[in-house]
């Protein structure tokens, strides 16, 4: 008796954060020899029988959760982890600042503050070079991001986004970059 089929992986290239009108490719990858794939957009009743979805120009309606599976014989694999495809640039960019300032001594504390003139209730902070939002794996959906006991690893370029919990896959443009220097 064969063991259970491994679940496929689903990734967005170059990134799952996609500016409006920019291209993105969703790719589902199962074990070698598999060629029957189903790629689904959740909460939309849609699916396609392809391992690859190329989106030449990102649109609002394409943002959302995606998942894929493959068929081997008459068996379906477990689904991939969900991929959250986010459209950015839907709203004006927020501003990102550091309190007390962008230069901080190692061992000190700093708070990164994301501010917007709109009534958004969700915020995400990204550090350049990191694939996921700051404080991975949990998203810090709040306007203030305290960093306690700063280390050299916190040095880098940060950007934040704002969005609404009612439309969690439609984000603002990124804030201007903030350079955090740890001395």
């Amino acid at each position: 008796q064969r063991g259970p089929l491994p679940k496929p992986s689903l990734q967005a290239l170059p990134s799952s954060l996609v500016p409006l009108e920019k291209p993105v490719t969703l790719r589902c990858q199962g074990p070698p020899g598999v060629d029957l794939y189903r790629l689904e957009k959740l909460s939309s009743s849609r699916y396609q029988d392809q391992a690859v979805l190329f989106i030449p120009a990102m649109k609002r309606h394409l943002a959302g959760r995606y998942r894929c599976s493959y068929q081997n014989g008459s068996l379906w694999s477990p689904p991939s982890d969900q991929l959250e495809l986010v459209a950015t640039g839907v709203f004006a960019k927020p501003s990102l600042s550091a309190q007390p300032g962008p230069a901080v001594s190692s061992g000190g504390d700093v708070t990164l503050q994301c501010q917007t003139r709109y009534g958004f209730d969700q915020f995400a902070l990204y550090k350049e070079g990191d694939p996921a939002p700051y404080k991975n794996p949990e998203r810090w959906y709040r306007a203030s991001f305290p960093i306690i006991t700063v280390t050299a690893a916190h040095s880098g370029t940060y950007r934040c986004y704002s969005f609404s919990s009612g439309d969690p896959y439609l984000w603002s443009a990124p804030s201007d970059p903030l350079e955090l220097m740890v001395t």
Epitope: L42, S45, R46, Y47, D49, R65, S74, W76
Partner: antibody, heavy 123, light 112 residues
Framework: QVQLVESGGGLVKPGGSLRLSCAAS????????MSWIRQAPGKGLEWVSS????????DYAASVKGRFTISRDNAKNSLYLQMNSLRAEDTAVYYC????????????????WGQGTLVTVSS | QSVLTQPPSVSGAPGQRVTISCTGS?????????VHWYQQLPGTAPKLLIY???NRPSGVPDRFSGSKSGTSASLAITGLQAEDEADYYC???????????FGGGTKLTVLG
Amino acid sequence: QVQLVESGGGLVKPGGSLRLSCAASGFSFSDHYMSWIRQAPGKGLEWVSSVGSEGKFIDYAASVKGRFTISRDNAKNSLYLQMNSLRAEDTAVYYCARHYREFRWHYYYFDYWGQGTLVTVSS
Amino acid sequence: QSVLTQPPSVSGAPGQRVTISCTGSSSNIGAGYDVHWYQQLPGTAPKLLIYGNSNRPSGVPDRFSGSKSGTSASLAITGLQAEDEADYYCQSHDLGAHVWVFGGGTKLTVLG
């Protein structure tokens, strides 16, 4: 306009076989997933089987797996259901149904149904 | 035993509002799959009534509306009319074996 016409139903003895056909017209048949759905007398709807637009993806309900075979001929705009080892509980009206499609996407619902063909399994 | 659970029957007087519930699980409605509703008038084939939880195909009166929350969904019919007397079925998809699933159906009786 979209039309789905089932045929091939009738009276058959337990253990017997029957082949249902569904003739499609009024749309691009080869673009759509198709399904067979049945309804036993006085009962609810039960999905039986579906086949992908190119005939590659095929799924069956557990109750018919190994006994029924779905197929399609896109050149003839036709859907088929070969039913073997029939049982009394397979007695039902069998509907052919089209899955909605828009651009490259298929959808998980049925936008057009045929009028059905009655299959009676009885000795 | 249907995968989705509906009440066997509901009834209402002309002009009234009735709702029909459809309860699923974490492998179908709760797994991110939409709910669709079909109306089957006596002696006829089912007809698509609501798709994608709350959308009406052209020709379906706005007296019919649908909603979804968590692992369940509901169909509401306002301003009940005699011609609404029919069987109503909810349908979704199940992630486990990628099968299409239906509710057991609800018979709507318009009183009087």
